[in-house]
Structure formats: C-alpha cells, structure tokens
C-alpha cells in the first residue's frame, strides 16, 4: 500500500497532491457489512429451508400410527406422550381379534388414515415448493459467495462452508477497518488534508463551518466524520 | 537532520501558566499530528493530546481538558503548549512528538521540557 | 480508557542472552500498538509499531509478536545498547495509552 505521507530527505513527507472532489461516499467496509449480512441471511435460510425439508421427509416416513395408547390418550395427531417402558404382549387370540374387529373407531373422534389423492398432492406440491425454495436460497447463496456464481455445480455442502469462509474473511476486514479507523482516532494516522479537499468539504458542510466540539476533542473545521471518512479513503 | 526542539526548562510557582514550544525542523511540520506527552516518576508516560498542525484539529485526553491548550504556528514550524492552574503534580517532563504509523512510519521525540512547580 | 500492563517490571539479562518481555491491553486492541525503548535522560525510540513492523534502523535481533490483547517484544543476542527501559502503547483510538514500563538491566 501506498503511505500518504512520503519521506523527504531525512524521512519527512510531503505534501499530498489536491485531489479532485469526489462524490461522498461511505466506506468500503459498510459495502462489505452489507454483503456479509446478505450472505449470512442467505446461508440461514438456506439452512432453515433444509432443515425443515428433513423435518417433512422425517413427518412422511413415519405414517400417523393411529391407534389408542395404552393410557386411553390417543397417540397420533401431535401429543407427545412420554414413552412406555413395559411393552404388552401382543394376544394372536382369534376371539379378540373379533373384538377389536368389531370396535367402531369413529366415535372416538378420528378416522381411520386412508390417504386422499387430493391430500397427497396437495403434500407433494408442498414439497415439491419447498425443494424449491432451498435451491432458490442456495442458488441465492451460491451467487453471493466467492467463484460461486461461475460455479453452478458447487454443492450445497461446498455453498454452506464457502459461505462461513467468506463471511469469516468479511468479519476480518471489518476488524481492519475497526483497527484503522481507531488508529485515525487516535491521531497516529491521519495524513495531512489537501487545501482543494478541505474546500471541497467546507462548502458541502455549508458556510461557516461551525466550531464542533466533543469529549474526544474540539474538531475545527472538519467534523470528525468528515475527517475520518477523508482519511479513510487517503489510506485506501 | 529531522528534529522536533523544545524551549528550555521553566520553574514557575503553584497557581501560574507555562506556555513551551516545539520547533519542527528537517521535515514539514504539518505532514503529521503532533502528539503532547507527558513523564513523570509516578505515573510514568501520559497522552495529553494531539493537533492537527494542518489544520489546527485537536484533540485531548480527558484528563487534560482544560489543563492544556494545543496551538500552532504554521508560518514558524512551531506548535506551542500551554499548561495552566499548575501544581506540584505537574512538575515533569513533556515531551513533543511527531506521529505517524502508517506504510512509512514516523515517529520523532523532542528532546523535552522540564517543567518543575515549586513555591 | 484502555489499560495497558508491562510485565515483568523489571528485568537482568547479560550480553548475548534472548529476552523476552510481555504487553497486556485490558481489551482487544487488534495489532493497534507500538514499543518504544528509552535510554536514561533521553527521549524514546520507536522499535516496533502495528505490533510486528520494525521501524527503520531498528536491528533485526528485536521482534514484536501478538495481537488482540496480548503482545510480546523479543530481543535476540542482547547488545550492550539495548539495556534501557522498553514501553509498549495501544493506539486503539483515544486516548492513547502507555504501559508503566519493563526496565532491562545488565545482569
């Protein structure tokens, strides 16, 4: 990178050059703030969406079991009941076989599982929505994380840790950006301040530039705002 | 030679002020922040503030405020401290630094000035 | 305000030994820090800044080490020149403060 501030004979610096007045801009790392926050927004979901899909497949897989528990409490239809230790023999007598032939289901205020094709496809076109909304938010993801724009066939795995990658190097740069900012805040890095830019930001700030006072210091003529922001891009 | 020269010692009584100065010389003085530090035997090394020589920013530790005025003259090279309300705790050296830890770093110490408050 | 703390305070070492001294900021300072030496009845030098970087001049036998909250400043075959006492300072934003000092003495 190229310091600002060049040595003379001796290691003095120089004075920058004016630079032409450029649009005010917020800097780099609230870009990468942003891109961090949709990447990491993108990976939840993606996460939530296949979550959820395990959850359904799970869901099918185990066909509601509908038949009285032991305790009277019916054990489909969501109740969660603690599971019972002592299993019961399972009486082969023909005699109650008969009975439990003859028991009538319906007065017990649920029907038998017999499986409507509506109500399948209905199910199938959820999951069917649901798939595609994982690979919207993988597809999604993908396009936000380094190469994976390019690289359609990257996995969902190779998504999610490229992802982690590219948010943790984002974290890191945020963390620069703190450090350097701080150091500008502390003095040890701000490069002296062309006369054409400060101009430039006087007459955006409005004249007369009022006196701006703080805890930290009494800021005369450039907010401390507009000098860290100034410095920022110096530094760049 | 890049130097930062300090005036001389100054004895001065409880209550009074003490204005000291830094002449840059080697190096333009408004290329870098000039930072104010101050050592004494109990609390070893103290930022009191830097300014901008540029453009005349300052900015103070807390504990200063009030107690120390940052200026400077950019026509002479010279940035001035002045130290008001002075009492015996302030009896130390102070020292003018030029400040600068970017790519190509600079940091130059003057020499110092003692400042001795006593009746 | 950021407390920075120098351990051991002091510290005897002969010519030619590798020593070894230790910076703790109170909070994540990230890489903000430098160690300046100073001589009895001098001003201080810079040695090292944004924690690893040597200022120019400066033997290579010195190294700066760590980030975050904890540093160290290493000299390697100590010179006759290098005893002295060794500061450390964050300039993790203001105000800037300086640690009480490791005093490095001739054994």
């Known amino acids: 990178m190229e310091s600002s501030a060049k040595m003379e004979s001796g290691g003095a610096g120089q004075q920058p050059q004016p630079q032409p007045q450029q649009p005010f801009l917020p800097p780099a790392a609230c870009f990468f703030a942003t891109a961090a926050a949709a990447a990491a927004a993108a990976a939840a979901a993606a996460a939530q969406s296949a979550q959820q899909q395990q959850q359904q497949q799970q869901q099918q897989q185990q066909a509601p079991q509908l038949r009285p528990a032991a305790d009277g409490q019916p054990s489909g239809g969501g109740h969660k009941s603690a599971p019972k230790q002592v299993k019961r023999q399972r009486s082969s007598s023909p005699e109650l076989m008969r009975c439990k032939r003859r028991l009538n289901f319906s007065g017990f205020g649920y029907s038998l599982p017999q499986q409507q094709p509506a109500a399948v496809a209905r199910r199938n076109e959820r999951e069917r929505n649901r798939v595609k909304l994982v690979n919207l938010g993988f597809a999604t993801l993908r396009e936000h994380v380094p190469n994976g724009a390019a690289n359609k066939k990257m996995s969902k795995v190779e998504t999610l840790r490229s992802a982690v990658e590219y948010i943790r190097a984002l974290q890191q740069l945020l963390d620069e950006h703190d450090a350097v900012s701080a150091a500008f805040q502390a003095g040890v890095l701000s490069p002296t301040i062309s006369p054409n830019y400060s101009n430039d930001l006087n007459s955006m700030a409005g004249s007369p530039v009022s006196s701006y006072s703080s805890d930290e210091g009494s800021y005369d003529p450039l907010s401390p705002e507009e000098q860290e922001l100034l410095d920022f891009t110096n530094w760049f | 030679e890049v130097q930062l020269l300090q005036s001389g010692p100054e004895l001065v009584k409880p209550g009074a002020s003490v204005k000291m100065s830094c002449k840059a010389s080697g190096y333009t003085l408004t290329d870098y922040n000039l930072h104010w530090v101050k050592q004494s035997h109990a609390k070893s090394l103290e930022w009191i503030g830097y300014i901008n020589p540029y453009n005349g920013v300052t900015s103070y530790n807390q504990r200063f405020k009030g107690k120390a005025t940052l200026t400077v003259n950019k026509s002479s090279s010279t940035a001035f401290m002045e130290f008001r309300s002075l009492t015996s705790e302030d009896s130390a050296v102070y020292y003018c630094?030029?400040?600068?830890?970017?790519?190509?770093?600079?940091?130059?110490w003057g020499q110092g000035t003692l400042v001795t408050v006593s009746t | 305000d950021i407390q920075m703390t120098q351990s051991p305070a002091s510290l005897s070492a002969s010519v030619g030994e590798t020593v070894t001294m230790t910076c703790r900021a109170s909070e994540n300072i990230y890489s903000n820090l430098a160690w300046y030496q100073q001589k009895q009845g001098k001003s201080p030098q810079l040695l090292v800044y944004?924690?690893?970087n040597l200022a120019d001049d400066v033997p290579s036998r010195f190294s700066g080490s760590g980030s975050g909250t904890q540093f160290s400043l290493k000299i390697n075959s100590l010179q006759p020149e290098d005893f002295g006492i060794y500061y450390c300072?964050?300039?993790?934003?203001?105000?800037?403060?300086f640690g009480a000092g490791t005093k490095l003495e001739l054994k």
């Open positions: 630094v030029s400040l600068y830890y970017g790519d190509d770093p600079f940091a130059c």
């Open positions: 300072h964050h300039f993790y934003g203001s105000p800037l403060t």
């Open positions: 944004a924690a690893t």
